[in-house]
């Protein structure tokens, strides 16, 4: 989702880790939403 950033070596070296971090944060956000929803 970052076409221009793909020219940066950093993008290549961190891609997997950044994807993992994003997935983890989405999972945490979903869990947080679930907790909030359950408490209503």
């Amino acid at each position: 989702d970052n076409p221009s950033l793909s020219i940066d070596l950093t993008f290549h070296l961190l891609r997997t880790l950044l994807e993992l971090a994003r997935t983890q944060s989405q999972r945490e956000r979903a869990e947080q939403n679930r907790i909030i929803f359950d408490s209503v």
């Epitope: 989702d1 970052n2 221009s4 950033l5 020219i7 940066d8 070596l9 950093t10 993008f11 290549h12 070296l13 961190l14 880790l17 950044l18 971090a21 994003r22």
Partner: antibody, heavy 118, light 112 residues
Framework: QVQLVQSGAEVKKPGASVKVSCKAS????????MKWVRQAPGQRLEWMGV????????FYNQKFKGRVTITRDTSASTAYMELSSLRSEDTAVYYC???????????WGQGTLVTVSS | DVVMTQSPLSLPVTLGQPASISCRSG???????????LEWYQQRPGQSPRLLIY???NRFSGVPDRFSGSGSGTDFTLKISRVEAEDLGVYYC?????????FGGGTKVEIK
Amino acid sequence: QVQLVQSGAEVKKPGASVKVSCKASGYTFTDYFMKWVRQAPGQRLEWMGVINPNNADIFYNQKFKGRVTITRDTSASTAYMELSSLRSEDTAVYYCARGTDRALFAYWGQGTLVTVSS
Amino acid sequence: DVVMTQSPLSLPVTLGQPASISCRSGQSIVHSDGNTYLEWYQQRPGQSPRLLIYKVSNRFSGVPDRFSGSGSGTDFTLKISRVEAEDLGVYYCFQGSHIPWTFGGGTKVEIK
């Protein structure tokens, strides 16, 4: 030409926080990740973290996680590094740096000396 | 973390003579993509670091051809064919193949 200009030297007390800025020019700010590296007296260079200026994705060196916060302002083409709960061992020169398609730290800021002293 | 060990710590040189700096990594720094992200940086007194070599042996733009890099796996070398006064300073190796990215402790090149 690529230029990274950092904010001036700071003197802080133990326990305080410091925020260093890095203004980029000479290229499109959102095209390249920005990294932060520090150099304490008599110590090796240490990579602290990196930010994707496009979407603010950040990856920190675990050693600094919880104490360092990297942010950016795309409208000002500026990256920031904030370090909290400062201790004397954080006395160092802090650098921002940018890579290329071939290397990780091709361009460096001039460095910002942060002194932590009571 | 991958520990990068440089030797010697200090390198007294004679201007016009060759110089060689060694860098060893605690484990292989061949990335999963097959590349070795080993870089060399020069830091002159009072200045920011400057990129010299990337991916083991490639000179960055503007770097004089008296600088050359070699090595593989865990063993790397930076050579200066004929040391000039402007080459004095501290040299660092760096690996970007494994997170966290790590630097060597530095080698100070000084006049004998």
